[in-house]
């Protein structure tokens, strides 16, 4: 099993709509896979593939989960707000016939706010 | 490019037990998402799939082999191995190494096969 | 274990023609989860390793001439030469990848006639 994902990194406007992608292959075919995203270490969803459809279709606030065959799990952030921002990491395991995990490697997600001086305010709080 | 050439005795007496080695080339056997089997075609041109070690030393083997099989990895050679145990005249063939992916799963570069004959 | 039976055991074809090789699954190879067939076909000169055409059934692998074409879906197969060519004389194989045991098909032995 071997889990890609995509992009690295994604900058986006506060209210916009952000898409992060996972693509799942494995070898041999599978009757039920486990899917998960985190944000920052927390689980936003757990559901399962089998049958070519999601479990659930909905992924922590505002996210929408999807499956398009073969092989992409995508999750749709829309509209996207500040506490998006954070590290996203996709998670698969094949239950059935038998277990094999692996996950992604991680989506910074960085959310600009809608008003500039925001951003301006947020860019000099950092330190250096 | 990834370079598969199988390597060992090309005679085994009966009971003994057979072991080969896969030097890989120009790819690391440790790659997520590769899988490297060792295949058997029979002097009939029969083929069969003996088993599989992954990226990760996991390994898969058929089971009309029973326990006979054992395939390893030494990723600092860069190599597999295959063992198969209490062999019989059953067991002549052409031994070859090949690689699949879990993107493409299928075996697309193979070993050029070494011919192990069982005899006393 | 998933058995694969190829049909006919040989073929002799006349330059030019078209020919036919059939391969039949035990059980079916289509997964709903990734509307993939896992099938894949391969071809085999003599003192050569095998070398891949054709993947999940129907799509032919970067470089191979457009002649040979997959076809089916669930339990039964056909590899497609459009038009034989000398060079196209070789064995011929099918394979599944939906579970282990992977297994193969006993073979097509292609001749011209």
């Known amino acids: 099993l071997s889990v890609q994902q995509g992009p690295n990194l994604l900058q986006v406007r506060q209210g916009s709509q952000a898409t992060l992608v996972c693509q799942v292959d494995q070898a041999t075919a599978w009757e039920r896979l486990r899917v998960k995203w985190t944000k920052d270490g927390a689980i936003l969803c757990q559901p399962y593939i089998t049958n070519g459809s999601l479990s659930l279709g909905v992924c922590g606030p505002q996210g929408r989960l999807s499956w398009q065959a073969p092989s992409h799990l995508t999750l749709q952030l829309d509209p996207v707000s500040l506490n998006h921002s954070g590290a996203y990491v996709c998670w698969a395991a094949v239950e059935i016939p038998e277990l094999e995990e692996a996950e992604g490697n991680i989506t910074r997600l960085f959310v600009d706010p809608d008003d500039p001086t925001q951003n301006r305010n947020r860019i000099a709080s950092f330190p250096g | 490019q990834v370079q598969l050439q199988e390597s060992g005795p090309g005679l085994v007496k009966p009971s003994q037990t057979l072991s080969l080695t896969c030097t890989v080339s120009?790819?690391?056997?440790?790659?997520?998402?590769?899988?490297w089997s060792w295949i058997r075609q029979f002097p009939g041109k029969r083929l069969e799939w003996m088993g599989y070690?992954?990226?990760?030393?996991?390994?898969s083997y058929n089971p009309s082999l029973k326990s006979r099989v054992t395939i390893s990895r030494d990723t600092s050679k860069n190599q597999f191995s295959l063992k198969l145990s209490s062999v019989t005249a059953a067991d002549t063939a052409t031994y070859c190494c090949?690689?699949?992916?879990?993107?493409?799963?299928?075996?697309?570069?193979w070993g050029q096969g070494t011919m192990v004959t069982v005899s006393s | 274990d998933i058995v694969m039976t190829q049909s006919p055991d040989s073929l002799a074809v006349s330059l030019g023609e078209r020919a036919t090789i059939n391969c039949k699954s035990s059980?079916?190879?289509?997964?709903?989860?990734?509307?993939?067939?896992?099938l894949n076909w391969y071809q085999q000169k003599p003192g050569q390793s095998p070398k891949l055409l054709i993947y999940?059934?129907?799509t032919r692998l970067s470089g191979v001439p457009d002649r040979f074409s997959g076809s089916g879906s669930g339990t039964d197969f056909t590899l497609t030469i459009s038009s034989l060519q000398a060079e196209d004389v070789a064995d011929y194989y099918c394979?599944?990848?939906?579970?282990?045991?992977?297994?193969f098909g006993d073979g097509t032995k292609l001749e011209i006639k």
């Open positions: 070690i992954n990226y990760g030393g996991g390994t």
């Open positions: 999940h059934a129907s």
């Open positions: 059980q079916s190879l289509f997964s709903s989860n990734t509307n993939r067939n896992y």
């Open positions: 090949a690689t699949m992916a879990d993107r493409f799963a299928f075996f697309d570069v």
């Open positions: 394979q599944h990848h939906y579970e282990t045991p992977l297994t």
């Open positions: 120009g790819f690391s056997i440790s790659t997520s998402g590769y899988y």
